[in-house]
């Protein structure tokens, strides 16, 4: 999780801090949203269960040219133990359901805030 504190991070970031920073970035995205996020791009919905960080990254990595979520993509990669590339899909995707990136971020944010409150950081 070293990378989650930013590239100049002096050392490993505690998991709770990494999760808080991811949440704060998602809050930033939702609050600073003027036009439709990522031009209204659609992504696969995911099951918010174990392994959801990789699933979330797999969904969002397919959105290209959207600077608003680039930091989120980087942060999610720090939570995902394997390398994720575009076109990759896990069983956690609800493959028949696509939602707008804005809704995806909102759902993910809500879930992550609850994980933080319950002390579930991994």
């Amino acid at each position: 999780l070293t990378c989650l504190g930013g590239f100049a991070s002096p050392g490993p970031v505690p998991p709770s801090t990494a999760l808080r920073e991811l949440i704060e970035e998602l809050v930033n995205i939702t609050q600073n949203q003027k036009a439709p996020l990522c031009n209204g791009s659609m992504v696969w919905s995911i099951n918010l269960t174990a392994g959801m960080y990789c699933a979330a990254l797999e969904s969002l990595i397919n959105v290209s040219g959207c600077s608003a979520i680039e930091k989120t993509q980087r942060m999610l990669s720090g939570f995902c133990p394997h390398k994720v590339s575009a076109g990759q899909f896990s069983s956690l995707h609800v493959r028949d359901t696509k939602i707008e990136v804005a809704q995806f971020v909102k759902d993910l944010l809500l879930h992550l805030k609850k994980l933080f409150r319950e002390g579930q950081f991994n």
Epitope: S16, T17, L19, R20, L48, L110, H111, K113, K114, F116, R117, E118, G119, F121
Partner: antibody, heavy 120, light 112 residues
Framework: EVQLVESGGGLVQPGGSLRLSCAAS????????IHWVRQAPGKGLEWVAR????????KYDPKFQGRFTISRDNAKNSLYLQMNSLRAEDTAVYYC?????????????WGQGTLVTVSS | DIQMTQSPSSLSASVGDRVTITCRSS???????????LEWYQQKPGKAPKLLIY???NRFSGVPSRFSGSGSGTDFTLTISSLQPEDFATYYC?????????FGGGTKVEIK
């Protein structure tokens, strides 16, 4: 405007059952946690249980586990507390309360409470 | 379970007095996320509780500045710097860090 309204209280005999309701308005219950807190007459506050209506993640005070069941109906934006095998010591005002919606740090809204009296 | 012990259980005071209520937890209430979920609620007869202080020392919106909270680890304090007529009520501390969450026994502040 955020509101929580409890109902379903009343007089019940020892060993009986009662189902309390908490109707929420002004917010979506899936966005937060809802708790039940009770207060016996002239006594202090006692936390009973909590539910995450988004995924049915439920926590109880162990002393109520097995007798009390918390549930929700997201379509009705409502919460319930099913109370079985009631005892005289369960006589109390029962409140539902919600955790605030940003970081779930505290209870920001409470209902007015509903009185449950267990007596023969 | 974590016991929250409040003292005193009741006190008599006059308008303008400085009032201090203490709350001691039977073990640390620092959550694994680093926060200390220690709250203070005020309750008047026949009414639902109202939040005053959250996370030890943060005043809830609309709460007068005469109310303040402090402490760490297992020892916490609610201070009312200058008691007002509307402050006569019962005060409860609450820990929301470890399940089952628990309230203190309450402190009733009465008019001297």
């Amino acid at each position: 405007e955020v509101q929580l309204v409890e109902s379903g209280g009343g007089l019940v005999q020892p060993g009986g059952s009662l189902r309390l309701s908490c109707a929420a308005s002004g917010f979506n219950i899936k966005d937060t946690y809802i708790h039940w807190v009770r207060q016996a007459p002239g006594k202090g506050l006692e936390w009973v249980a909590r539910i995450d209506p988004a995924n049915d993640n439920i926590k109880y005070d162990p002393k109520f586990q097995g007798r009390f069941t918390i549930s929700r109906d997201n379509a009705k934006n409502s919460l319930y507390l099913q109370m079985n095998s009631l005892r005289a010591e369960d006589t109390a005002v029962y409140y539902c309360a919600r955790s605030e919606e940003n970081w779930y740090d505290f209870f920001d809204y409470w209902g007015q409470g509903t009185l449950v009296t267990v007596s023969s | 379970d974590i016991q929250m012990t409040q003292s005193p259980s009741s006190l008599s005071a006059s308008v303008g007095d400085r009032v201090t209520i203490t709350c001691r937890s039977s073990q640390s209430i620092v959550h694994s996320n680093g926060n200390t979920y220690l709250e203070w609620y005020q309750q008047k007869p026949g009414k639902a509780p109202k939040l005053l202080i959250y996370k030890v020392s943060n005043r809830f919106s609309g709460v007068p500045s005469r109310f303040s909270g402090s402490g760490s680890g297992t020892d916490f304090t609610l201070t009312i710097s200058s008691l007002q007529p509307e402050d006569f009520a019962t005060y409860y501390c609450f820990q929301g860090s470890h399940i089952p969450y628990t309230f203190g026994g309450g402190t009733k502040v009465e008019i001297k």
